[in-house]
Interface confidence: low
């Protein structure tokens, strides 16, 4: 018989089956079962420890003391239990890029931390810009080609949404300012309205200049929801406003509806990998 | 401002349960962060202790996981330490501190520490 | 446990050195590493987090570096308050620890 739970892992989870029960009871659901905050069922003779977290789609990448980027805290710890290994969140933000390495793909590259090192004329190029020294005034060239992208629409720090993860790179080079994913989907709240701007991205005509005070606002003003409204949201968070007095859902990617319920068709995924974005 | 401070008696004796509490003010422990003990014997380094999440999980460190417990009273806006069967080994300055930020475990702000002396 | 060892355990110098302390951990801990100052009697004030990055209020003179297993504080131009203990910290991994510190004297 196997002497631990990690001697039973299996790919999605782990499987213990053909021990009797009643010689070795180590394998019953308690609070130490599973480790790293996976889920303990026993169906008949089998205990499997699950972990499908029930991560939203926030993007609030965080770096792994694995080294390892992820899309935010949840998929972190979906992770750590996946792999039944500890994994911390060592800092937020993707994991550091090497430095100098000029390829424009780290998420958080040229993220406006102040450099310790001393400066060239070619510094000065952020966000996946390249220096051209020979140029008489411009320095920075952005040569991103967004044109082979697939559509995947996102909504960017800046407040405006852009058709995919490419072209918030793009922009974020030729403002070189910091322009990060903030969630998927296109910008939307239930009292703004979408404007089609004339560079052709469309801005939330009242999102607050910065994006990030916007989303901590709003965080503060939802609690978790209390016990007896497990399974109020099928696939998503549940959500408890101090200013309603029925819980809301904030669904995971791919869901829509009022408990999350129902499969949006229209979203198509990106996963945030160590360096730079997968479509899946 | 934020402000920590570390209360509890000063001298304790062997095998008995040390007790100390940190008060915080300017911040509610259950809106985030990470709220750490940590030690330091007369003339040596830092040992970390552990800490009490904002959602009230803890982490300890295994070198005292039998005997370490971090608790809080959110009412009061303060976490509490307790060692069990103290030895002389567990004299040092004992400090609160919070952590920076989320995902950032490095800590900002400390109590002024309280020295604990465990002698009969 | 990942041990951080620090080096030197002391130094003496002078008011305008420049100042350099090292601190190996026994794993890799990515950039998860912080350091701290602290005078006789006080406790610890953070100086540096995320190996590189200057806390609020902190002077520009006071750097971090390195990643991995390596890491550095520079005291650019060592300054009258300067004079104290350092440590270096780990985050990376449970249980957080320190290194054994390293006492600047003046020389």
């Known amino acids: 018989f196997p002497t631990s739970l990690s001697d039973c892992q299996t790919p999605t989870g782990w499987n213990c089956s053909g021990y009797d029960d009643r010689e070795n009871d180590l394998f019953l659901c308690d609070t130490n079962t599973c480790k790293f905050d996976g889920e303990c069922l026993r169906i008949g003779d089998t205990v499997t420890c699950v972990c499908q977290f029930k991560c939203n789609s926030d993007y609030v990448p965080v770096c792994g003391s694995n080294g390892e980027s992820y899309q935010n805290e949840c998929y972190l710890r979906q992770a750590a239990c996946k792999q039944q290994s500890e994994i911390l969140v060592v800092s937020e933000g993707s994991c550091a890029t090497d430095a100098g390495s000029g390829s424009g793909d780290g998420v958080h590259e040229g993220s406006g931390e102040t450099s310790q090192k001393e400066t060239s004329t070619c510094d000065i190029c952020q966000f996946g810009a390249e220096c051209d020294e020979d140029a008489e005034d411009v320095w920075c060239v952005c040569n991103i080609d967004c044109s082979q992208t697939n559509f995947n629409p996102l909504c960017a720090s800046d407040g405006k949404s852009y058709d995919n993860a490419c072209q918030i790179k793009e922009a974020s080079c030729q403002k070189q300012e910091k322009i990060e994913v903030m969630s998927l989907g296109r910008c939307q709240d239930n009292t703004t309205t979408t404007t089609k701007s004339e560079d052709g991205h469309y801005a939330r005509t009242d999102y607050a200049e910065n994006a990030n005070k916007l989303e901590e606002s709003a965080r503060e003003h939802h609690i978790p929801c209390p016990e007896h409204y497990n399974g109020f949201c099928m696939h998503g968070k549940c959500e408890h406003s101090i200013n309603m007095q029925e819980p809301s859902c904030r669904c995971d990617a791919g869901y829509t509806g009022q408990h999350c319920e129902k499969k949006d068709y229209s979203v198509l995924y990106v996963v945030p990998g160590p360096v730079r974005f997968q479509y899946v | 401002d934020v402000q920590l401070q570390e209360s509890g008696p000063g001298l304790v004796k062997p095998s008995e349960t040390l007790s100390l509490t940190c008060a915080v003010s300017?911040?509610?422990?259950?809106?985030?962060?990470?709220w750490s003990w940590i030690r330091q014997p007369p003339g040596k380094g830092l040992e970390w202790m552990g800490f009490?999440?904002?959602?009230?999980?803890?982490k300890y460190n295994p070198s005292l996981k039998n005997r370490i417990t971090i608790s809080r009273d959110t009412s009061k806006n303060q976490f509490s330490l307790k060692l069990s069967s103290v030895t002389a080994a567990d004299t040092a300055v004992y400090y609160c501190?919070?952590?920076?930020?989320?995902?950032?475990?490095?800590?900002?702000?400390w109590g002024q520490g309280t020295l604990v002396t465990v002698s009969s | 446990d990942i041990q951080m060892t620090q080096s030197p355990s002391s130094l003496s110098a002078s008011v305008g050195d420049r100042v350099t302390i090292t601190c190996k951990a026994s794993q890799n801990v990515v950039t998860a590493v912080a350091w701290y100052q602290q005078k006789p009697g006080k406790a610890p004030k953070l100086l540096i987090y995320s190996a590189s990055n200057r806390h609020t209020g902190v002077p520009s003179r006071f750097s971090g570096s390195g990643s991995g297993t390596d890491f550095t504080l520079t005291i650019s131009s060592l300054q009258p308050e300067d004079f104290a203990t350092y440590y270096c910290?780990?985050?990376?991994?449970?249980?957080?620890?320190f290194g054994g510190g390293t006492k600047v004297e003046i020389k």
């Open positions: 501190a919070r952590g920076l930020r989320r995902g950032d475990y490095s800590m900002d702000y």
């Open positions: 009490i999440s904002y959602d009230g999980s803890n």
């Open positions: 910290q780990q985050y990376s991994s449970y249980p957080f620890t």
């Open positions: 300017g911040y509610s422990i259950t809106s985030g962060y990470y």
